[in-house]
Amino acid sequence: SPSGVRLVGGLHRCEGRVEVEQKGQWGTVCDDGWDIKDVAVLCRELGCGAASGTPSGILYEPPAEKEQKVLIQSVSCTGTEDTLAQCEQEEVYDCSHDEDAGASCENPESSFSPVPEGVRLADGPGHCKGRVEVKHQNQWYTVCQTGWSLRAAKVVCRQLGCGRAVLTQKRCNKHAYGRKPIWLSQMSCSGREATLQDCPSGPWGKNTCNHDEDTWVECEDPFDLRLVGGDNLCSGRLEVLHKGVWGSVCDDNWGEKEDQVVCKQLGCGKSLSPSFRDRKCYGPGVGRIWLDNVRCSGEEQSLEQCQHRFWGFHDCTHQEDVAVICSG
C-alpha cells in the first residue's frame, strides 16, 4: 500500500495531480472511482482542510513523466478515513497519464506550505523565530522596524505556519545583522493578509533605515514530541507535532546524539541505544513524515533545535520511522 502521498503541479501544496509512493517510487493514481470522498481523505491526510474538487490530473504542469508509473487503478474511500492507505484500492491494470487523478483542497493558506516562498525568519533558533527577510526578484531583503506592528508579525507567523505571533522586545543579534539590502519600511498590515507581501508598505528599497532597525519576530510554533506504541511514555515510535498534526521522523542520519536529545526533552533519562531490531518492534506509523536528516550535537534541549530538512520534505517511507528507547 502507498506509504506517502503528495499533490504536484498546483498553485500551492494543497492542490495538484495526486501522487503516491510505493517502495520508494512516486507514481500517479488513475481516476477510476475517484470522487470527492477520496479527495476529502487526501486533504485530511495532507493537513489541507476540506475537499473542494476533483480536477483532472492532466491540468497540472509539468505533466507526469512518461517513465513515471500509474500505481493505483482505483481508490474508494468512505470519506471518514485518516489516510488514503486506509481506503479500498486496486493495483493498476490499465491506465494512462491522461487519466491521472487530481485533487483540490479548500484550505491552501500559505500557512500550510512547508516552504513558504517569499518570507523567512533568519538567524533564530528554529524557523519560527528570527530576523524577518522577504524575497523579491530572487533576492532576500530585510524589513525595517519603522511602522512594524504585532499585526504584521501575525501575518508572518501565519504565512510560515508557525502559530500565533508572540509580543517580544527582542532585537536582532548584533553579530547576525542583516547584510542584505533593506527592503521595506512602513508596513501597515491589518493582520488578515495571507502573506506579508499583501500588506501595504512604503516604496521598495526606498528608506532611511539601517540594519540596527531590522525587524525580529517570534512565533509560538507549538512543537511537541511523543513516543507511541511502547509500554511507557519513554519508549516507542517517535512522533513530532507540527502545525497541529502529529507525524513521524525518518531514520536517515539518526543516531545516539539524536536519541539523547529526545530522551532529555521528554525527561526520560538517557537513551538505551537500542538495536536496529528493537527499534523496529513498534511498527510503522501512518500519515505525515515530518522530519528527515535530523542532526543534533547532543547539547540541544529540544529536537526542534537540531538541524533537519524542511518540515514535510523527505525521501522516506514509514518503514524508516525512528523509534527511541529511553531509560525512563
Epitope: 500500500s1 477510476d32 472511482g33 486506509q86 479500498e88 484500492q89 486496486e90 493495483e91 491494470y93
Partner: antibody
Framework: QSVKESGGRLVTPGTPLTLTCTVS????????INWVRQAPGKGLEWIGI?????NTYYASWAKGRFTISRTSTTVDLTMTSLTTEDTATYFC????????WGPGTLVTISS | ELVLTQTPSPVSAAVGGTVSISCQAS????????CSWYQQKPGQPPKLLIH???KLASGVPSRFKGSGSGTQFTLTINDLECDDAATYYC??????????FGGGTEVEIN
Amino acid sequence: QSVKESGGRLVTPGTPLTLTCTVSGFSLSINAINWVRQAPGKGLEWIGIITNIGNTYYASWAKGRFTISRTSTTVDLTMTSLTTEDTATYFCARNSYFDPWGPGTLVTISS
Amino acid sequence: ELVLTQTPSPVSAAVGGTVSISCQASQSVDSNNYCSWYQQKPGQPPKLLIHKASKLASGVPSRFKGSGSGTQFTLTINDLECDDAATYYCAGGLGDNIYAFGGGTEVEIN
C-alpha cells in the same frame, strides 16, 4: 500473476465446504479478489468480493450462506447449507476488471 | 440490484463477417467501472476482452470493439474468425463493490 482455486469436491447437501484461491505474483494488500460461479451449462454468477483492506461485499442471494476471508496469499470461500443448486464450477478472479481468472474448481452437491 | 440483459442469444455469422452483442443495464452503470466484456470457451475460464466500456485488454486483437455508456453497451466483433466461436458475457458494477454478469451470448461461426 495468477490465481488458482482448490478444495472443490463431491459433498452431500448441508455439508459445509471451504474453497481456497491461492494468488501469486501480486499482493492482496492492494488487490481485491472476487468469487464467481458457473452451474453446468449456465452463465456466470457473481458471489462476492474481498477488498485490499479486507472489506467483504456479497450478492444479495449469497449473504448469510457464503463467507469470504483471507490470509496474506490466499482467499477462502466458505459455503454452508449447500443444496444441489450450488453445484457449479467456482472461479476466483482479481479486482473489478476480473483478470486474471483461475481454472476453476468443481463443487458437486449430491446425496 | 443491478441486472444486465444480453441480446441476442445465440447469434450466427459467417467467417469475415461482423456481430454485435448488446448489454442493457437496469440502472446506470457506475461512471468509472462502466462495463467489461469476457469471452469464454467450453472447459475454460472467462477471458477479459474489454474494460471501462471501450478499452481493449492486453493481447486482445483490435477486431474486438466495445462502446456505450450509462445503461447501454455493445460489443462488436469484426472480421470474424473460427476461433471467435464462444460465449460472451458483459459485467458491470455500480461503484459500491457489487457486481453482476449478463446472461451470456453464444456466438456461432458458419
